[in-house]
Interface confidence: low
C-alpha cells in the first residue's frame, strides 16, 4: 500500500523552478510517499527543460539524504537518440527507473523496502550533449517507510552488587512502546531510552533490577502490530551466576 | 515595497470565531506558500499553518486541526486564517509569513507581517 | 513531530564578543534549518536559511553551519543592535517547528 501526497493541479505546490517562465527547468515530486518495509515504493519524479527537443547523452540520478551532496543510489545513462537509460548504479540492486527520461520521467521504484530507506530521496538530470545543462531537485521526496515492531535484542546483563538488569531494543515505524512483564512486575512500562543517533526506529527498555528467579517478557507495539520476546532469569543462589 | 500586512485581530469569548487577513504587496503573491505563526505572549514562535501558492494543499498543527482554515484569494493578494471555537491558549499575536522559495516544501520565511494580537477570554 | 532544542536558553555577552547559539533536531533533518532574530514588539527577521546561507541584508557577521541534527549560529562580533532573542526553525517536515528561543543579553 503506497500514499502519495501529490495533486497535479498545481503546478507550483511541488514544482522547483529555474529560469524563465516560457520555457524553464522545473521538478514536481511529491513531498512524501508512504508503504511498509517489506513492499515496494515508487518515488515520483517529473521534469521540464528549456532545451526543446533535445536528444542528446542524459544521466538520470537518485540520490539520497540531501540534494546535491548525498550519495547516489541510482544513476543510468542514456545514449543520444536512446530512449533505453542504460542502469550504471542501482544500490543493492532495490532501485529501478519507472519513468522514461526522454519522456521528462525520472520515477523510481524501490523495492523489498527497510526502514533503513525511510529517508529523502532526490532527482537529478543531466544533459551533456550539444548542450551542457542539469537541473536537481532541491527539496526532493520524503519515504516514509512503516513497520510493525521487531525485537532485535533481548538480554540479561550484571549490575554492580551481584544484580542483574534487562535489556530489550526493538524496531518499529512508528517506534514501538515497549513493556516489560514478569515475576512480581506485573505489566512495567519500563524506563524507556531515546533512539540512538542513527538509529531513530530502535528503542530500548531496561529493567534495571531483577529481583526474582523466572520469566521475563518484553512486548513491543504499535499501530501495525505487536511482537514479544522472553528472557529466563535463574540464579545459582549461593553463587553470582545466572541462567538466561 | 514588498510587504504584508495583518489585520482582523482582537477580543473574542472563548468558543467564539475571529477571521484574519493579511494583505501582500510588492511580489509575486501567486508563486509563494504563505504561512501563519504565532506567539502566546512571553513564549516562543509556533507555526500554525501553511496554504500552496495555488490553494489546492494545506496543512496545520495538529493544536488548531479542525478548528482553523488556512485560504487564499490570488487576485486580491490576500491571505486569510478562519479561526472557530477559539480557546484561552489560542491567545497570541499572529504573523503572516512567506516562504523564501516557490516550491512549497521551502526552506524558511523570509518576510513576516507586524502581527495581529487575538485575545481569548471571557 | 520534530523537536528543536537551542542552547543555551539565554546568554550575557558584551558588544564585540563572539557568541554561538546551538541548535539540535530530534532527528536528521539534513540541512532544512532557519535562524531567525526577533526584537520586543517586533516580528521575527529570517538571518539564515538552508543552515548556512546567508540572507540578502544581513550582516556578514552572522554565520551558520552545521547538518543532520546538530546546528550552530555564531555571531563574530557582537553589535548593540544584535541584543534580540534568536530562534532555529526546522522545514525538513511539517509541522514545522522552533526552538524555544535563546535570548542575548547585553552583560
Known amino acids: 500500500f503506497v500514499r502519495t501526497k501529490i495533486d497535479t493541479t498545481e503546478n507550483l505546490l511541488n514544482t522547483e523552478v529555474h529560469s524563465s517562465p516560457a520555457q524553464r527547468w522545473s521538478m514536481q515530486v511529491p513531498p512524501e510517499v508512504s508503504a511498509e518495509a517489506g513492499d515496494a515504493a515508487v518515488l515520483p519524479c517529473t521534469f521540464t527543460h528549456p532545451h526543446r527537443h533535445y536528444d542528446g547523452p542524459l544521466t538520470a540520478i537518485w540520490r539520497a539524504g540531501e540534494p546535491y551532496a548525498g550519495p547516489q543510489v541510482f544513476r543510468c545513462a542514456a545514449a543520444r537518440g536512446s530512449e533505453l537509460c542504460q542502469t550504471a548504479l542501482s544500490l543493492h540492486g532495490r532501485f529501478r527507473l519507472l519513468g522514461n527520461p526522454r519522456r521528462n520521467d525520472l520515477s523510481l521504484r524501490v523495492e523489498r523496502l527497510a526502514l533503513a530507506d525511510d529517508r529523502r530521496y532526490f532527482c537529478r538530470v543531466e544533459f551533456a550533449g550539444d548542450v551542457h545543462d542539469r537541473y536537481e531537485s532541491r527539496h526532493g521526496v520524503r519515504l516514509h517507510v512503516t513497520a510493525a515492531p521487531r525485537i532485535v535484542n533481548i538480554s540479561v546483563l550484571p549490575s554492580p552488587a551481584h544484580a542483574f538488569r534487562a535489556l530489550c531494543t526493538a524496531e518499529g515505524e512508528p517506534p514501538p512502546a515497549l513493556a516489560w512483564s514478569g515475576p512480581a512486575l506485573g505489566n512495567s512500562l519500563a524506563a524507556v531510552r531515546s533512539p540512538r543517533e542513527g538509529h531513530g526506529h530502535l528503542v530500548t527498555a531496561e529493567l534495571p533490577a531483577l529481583t526474582h528467579d523466572g520469566r521475563y517478557t518484553c512486548t513491543a507495539a504499535n499501530s501495525l502490530g505487536r511482537s514479544e520476546a522472553s528472557v529466563y532469569l535463574f540464579r545459582f543462589h549461593g553463587a553470582s551466576g545466572a541462567s538466561t | 515595497e514588498v510587504q504584508l500586512l495583518e489585520s482582523g485581530g482582537g477580543l473574542v469569548q472563548p468558543g467564539g470565531s475571529l477571521r484574519l487577513s493579511c494583505a501582500a504587496s510588492?511580489?509575486?503573491?501567486?508563486?509563494?506558500?504563505m504561512s501563519w505563526v504565532r506567539q502566546a505572549p512571553g513564549k516562543g514562535l509556533e507555526w500554525v499553518s501553511t496554504?500552496?501558492?495555488?490553494?489546492?494543499?494545506?496543512y496545520y498543527a495538529d493544536s488548531v486541526k479542525g478548528r482553523f482554515t488556512i485560504s487564499r484569494d490570488n487576485s486580491k493578494n490576500t491571505l486569510y486564517l478562519q479561526m472557530n471555537s477559539l480557546r484561552a491558549e489560542d491567545t497570541a499575536v499572529y504573523y503572516c509569513?512567506?516562504?523564501?522559495?516557490?516550491?512549497?516544501?521551502?526552506?524558511?520565511?523570509?518576510?513576516w507581517g507586524q502581527g495581529t494580537m487575538v485575545t481569548v477570554s471571557s | 513531530d520534530i523537536q528543536m532544542t537551542q542552547s543555551p536558553s539565554s546568554v550575557s555577552a558584551s558588544v564585540g564578543d563572539r557568541v554561538t547559539i546551538t541548535c539540535r533536531a530530534s532527528?536528521?533533518?539534513?540541512?532544512?534549518l532557519a535562524w531567525y532574530q526577533q526584537k520586543p514588539g517586533k516580528a521575527p527577521k529570517l538571518l539564515i536559511y538552508v543552515a548556512s546561507s546567508l540572507q540578502s541584508g544581513v550582516p556578514s557577521r552572522f554565520s551558520g553551519s552545521g547538518s543532520g541534527t546538530d546546528f550552530t549560529l555564531t555571531i563574530s562580533s557582537l553589535q548593540p543592535e544584535d541584543f534580540a532573542t534568536y530562534y532555529c526553525q526546522q522545514s525538513y517536515s511539517i509541522p514545522y517547528t522552533f526552538g524555544q528561543g535563546t535570548k542575548l543579553e547585553i552583560k
Open positions: 532527528q536528521d533533518i539534513s540541512s532544512w
Open positions: 496554504i500552496s501558492g495555488g490553494g489546492v494543499y494545506t
Open positions: 509569513a512567506k516562504a523564501i522559495g516557490s516550491s512549497w516544501y521551502s526552506d524558511a520565511f523570509d518576510l
Open positions: 510588492g511580489f509575486t503573491f501567486s508563486s509563494y506558500a
